[in-house]
Interface confidence: low
């Protein structure tokens, strides 16, 4: 439905506080060194433009494209070429390749100062002060940090964060009430962000298809009582409401979600019946529940798989005539029969289904050829299977750090090229999948794990992408989205990495390490572990455990010192003398 | 090679008892619900006994219960069915059959069967 002006049409649909926000969160995605002062003010040009386009669409430039209107708000920043270099070259471009270009720029690990938390009464009072500026402030720290947080949810971040405050500020433990829900939001966030990079990179790098057969396996686990046909339609709503966020069109994305939200709660009957809870809510927290619904039960009448994908004789018939709609009900159908199987697996099924076809609907005896396809499933089946069950045993035998360090050791000498924070980030991520998933029974495991684990290695593959210094590592993140794991799985020691030169100075430690939190101080251990590896990869598990145990024990002593930074200095130079020695440096 | 395979059938006299085996071979049995169905000469296959994957959800037939028992061991990947208290009308050929996760309602909602085994009360 055309609109004469799509600045009035979003402004209407979505309300001026939505619309503000979203708008914020363009901005701060796209001009992410931007400070805050200067984003508000484009914000409040552009309300202030779409309230008149609301009042008459016919006025000047209101029938102008959103991105020309953006774009050339952002273009107007006088800083542009001194803060963002080349990216100021993108404004000399028209639409549509000036927005690419903003978009070619986003930076996922932007040079920004980590975010450090004011005590709890001075954030009352700044929140007191002024509500409407302290929540914009959120919305523009974490939407430059994370150039692609979905713009929805954020909002629904943001009414949360605003709900905690407004709560705790005025409880009698302030601290006590506040910092929980911080650390939750902070976490819950961190993922929710990685999620959607996951989603972005699948569309960018993969293309549509890639999504939507992510999507068709995804939905159908979740609604394995919709129709085929049904399925199909918030497949391609929802690729289209993602494609808009990625492409940094959050108007767009955050007006169809809405819509998307709606259709699903008046067709719930035909969806899923777990779906009443969600949709007696509010519309961002409706929407957020939706996207986390837990799946619905199987029908108990379902017929085998077989009958219609290996046994019938109009198998090539019915894949020569519409190619994607079979290969996409053969999704549909394993997907629906398989809630205990990750989305990734499902696709390489369905990938390996798709490869034998091509071959056996040219084949003399095309039946005779697919007969025994079922079978090629088995050995793809069984790798997360066993993959899961051996590292949940590491994870309950070591326990969550040691996990880590397991993984740590374990991926510094795949890929030692990659740079050490990093590595640090990355393995303490994938780390996490214990304590994530290895509680659940095992019809839950592998879709908890395998799929967290893709989420993990994309943000590994995007923060290469920006600074590529291994070919192992371009490999396993380009060949294919869904054999991604597997492939980082598969990487043995690299012979060909020739270790880093030693420096003390690396190792060096002083009293500032008493004073971190338990997570800092593990983060500084492991950054030291992963250096050694870089310059000693062949040292075994023993010998790299001696040297953990005994820095643990040095960091312990020394922190307990009268005089702190002496211990850490005499000590230090001790534990480095004997951990070369131990290493044969 | 996935396979099903029954055993434990064979001739009881009325009042007698008999422990039947399902043993798969080429997949595990963790992530699968194992249902016994049964076949008398001339008759529908009918469903006898299920247990879902997590062992936690099992049910029965109204005509064997009270009299029959199923369980699974998946370290040995195999389901038994013990039948206590036999009737001539319990004669039929045993099958096993696997679907994934959960019992179903219909018969072809299994995606593999045994080739089954014969248990014949008879005095």
């Known amino acids: 439905d055309a609109h004469k002006s799509e600045v009035a049409h979003r402004f209407k649909d979505l309300g001026e506080e939505n619309f503000k926000a979203l708008v914020l969160i363009a901005f701060a995605q796209y001009l992410q060194q931007c400070p805050f002062e200067d984003h508000v003010k484009l914000v409040n040009e552009v309300t202030e433009f779409a309230k008149t386009c609301v009042a008459d669409e016919s006025a000047e430039n209101c029938d102008k494209s959103l991105h020309t209107l953006f774009g050339d708000k952002l273009c107007t920043v006088a800083t542009l070429r001194e803060t963002y270099g080349e990216m100021a070259d993108c404004c000399a471009k028209q639409e549509p390749e000036r927005n690419e270009c903003f978009l070619q720029h986003k930076d996922d690990n932007p040079n920004l100062p980590r975010l450090v938390r004011p005590e709890v009464d001075v954030m009352c009072t700044a929140f007191h002060d002024n509500e409407e500026t302290f929540l914009k402030k959120y919305l523009y720290e974490i939407a430059r940090r994370h150039p692609y947080f979905y713009a929805p949810e954020l909002l629904f971040f943001a009414k949360r964060y605003k709900a905690a405050f407004t709560e705790c500020c005025q409880a009698a433990d302030k601290a006590a009430c506040l910092l929980p829900k911080l650390d939750e939001l902070r976490d819950e966030g961190k993922a929710s962000s990685a999620k959607q990079r996951l989603k972005c990179a699948s569309l960018q790098k993969f293309g549509e298809r890639a999504f939507k057969a992510w999507a068709v396996a995804r939905l159908s686990q979740r609604f394995p009582k919709a129709e085929f046909a049904e399925v199909s339609k918030l497949v391609t709503d929802l690729t289209k409401v993602h494609t808009e966020c990625c492409h940094g069109d959050l108007l767009e994305c955050a007006d169809d979600r809405a819509d998307l939200a709606k259709y699903i709660c008046e067709n719930q009957d035909s969806i899923s019946s777990k779906l009443k809870e969600c949709c007696e809510k509010p519309l961002l927290e409706k929407s957020h529940c939706i996207a986390e619904v837990e799946n619905d039960e199987m029908p108990a009448d379902l017929p085998s798989l077989a009958a219609d994908f290996v046994e019938s004789k109009d198998v090539c018939k019915n894949y020569a005539e519409a190619k994607d709609v079979f290969l996409g009900m053969f999704l549909y159908e394993y997907a629906r029969r398989h809630p205990d199987y990750s989305v990734v697996l499902l696709l390489r099924l369905a990938k390996t289904y798709e490869t034998t076809l091509e071959k056996c609907c040219a084949a003399a005896d095309p039946h005779e050829c697919y007969a025994k396809v079922f079978d090629e499933f088995k050995p793809l089946v069984e790798e997360p299977q066993n993959l899961i069950k051996q590292n949940c045993e590491l994870f309950e035998q070591l326990g969550e750090y040691k996990f880590q360090n397991a993984l740590l050791v374990r991926y510094t000498k795949k890929v030692p090229q990659v740079s050490t924070p990093t590595l640090v980030e990355v393995s303490r991520n994938l780390g996490k999948v214990g304590s994530k998933c290895c509680k659940h029974p095992e019809a839950k495991r592998m879709p908890c794990a395998e799929d967290y684990l893709s989420v993990v290695l994309n943000q590994l593959c995007v923060l290469h992408e920006k600074t590529p210094v291994s070919d192992r590592v371009t490999k396993c993140c380009t060949e294919s989205l869904v054999n991604r794991r597997p492939c980082f799985s598969a990487l043995e020691v690299d012979e060909t990495y020739v270790p880093k030169e030693f420096n003390a100075e690396t190792f060096t430690f002083h009293a500032d390490i008493c004073t971190l939190s338990e997570k800092e101080r593990q983060i500084k251990k492991q950054t030291a572990l992963v250096e050694l590896v870089k310059h000693k990869p062949k040292a075994t598990k023993e010998q790299l455990k001696a040297v953990m145990d005994d820095f643990a024990a040095f960091v312990e002593k020394c922190c307990k010192a009268d005089d702190k930074e002496t211990c850490f200095a005499e000590e230090g130079k001790k534990l480095v003398a004997a951990s070369q020695a131990a290493l044969g440096l | 090679q996935v396979q099903l395979q029954e055993s434990g059938g064979g001739l009881v006299q009325p009042g007698g008892s008999l422990r039947l085996s399902c043993a798969a071979s080429?997949?595990?049995?963790?992530?699968?619900?194992i249902g016994w169905f049964r076949q008398a000469p001339g008759k529908e296959r009918e469903g006898v006994s299920c247990?879902?994957?997590?062992?936690?959800?099992?049910n029965y037939a109204d005509s064997v219960k009270g009299r029959f028992t199923i369980s699974r061991d998946n370290a040995e990947n195999t389901v038994y069915l013990q039948m206590n208290s036999l009737k001539p009308e319990d004669t039929a050929v045993y099958y096993c059959?696997?679907?994934?996760?959960?019992?179903?309602?219909?018969?072809?909602?299994?995606?593999?069967w045994g080739q089954g085994t014969q248990v014949t009360v008879s005095s």
């Open positions: 059959a696997a679907a994934v996760l959960e019992c179903r309602t219909v018969v072809r909602g299994y995606d593999y």
């Open positions: 080429g997949f595990t049995l963790d992530y699968y619900a």
């Open positions: 247990i879902a994957s997590s062992g936690g959800s099992t």
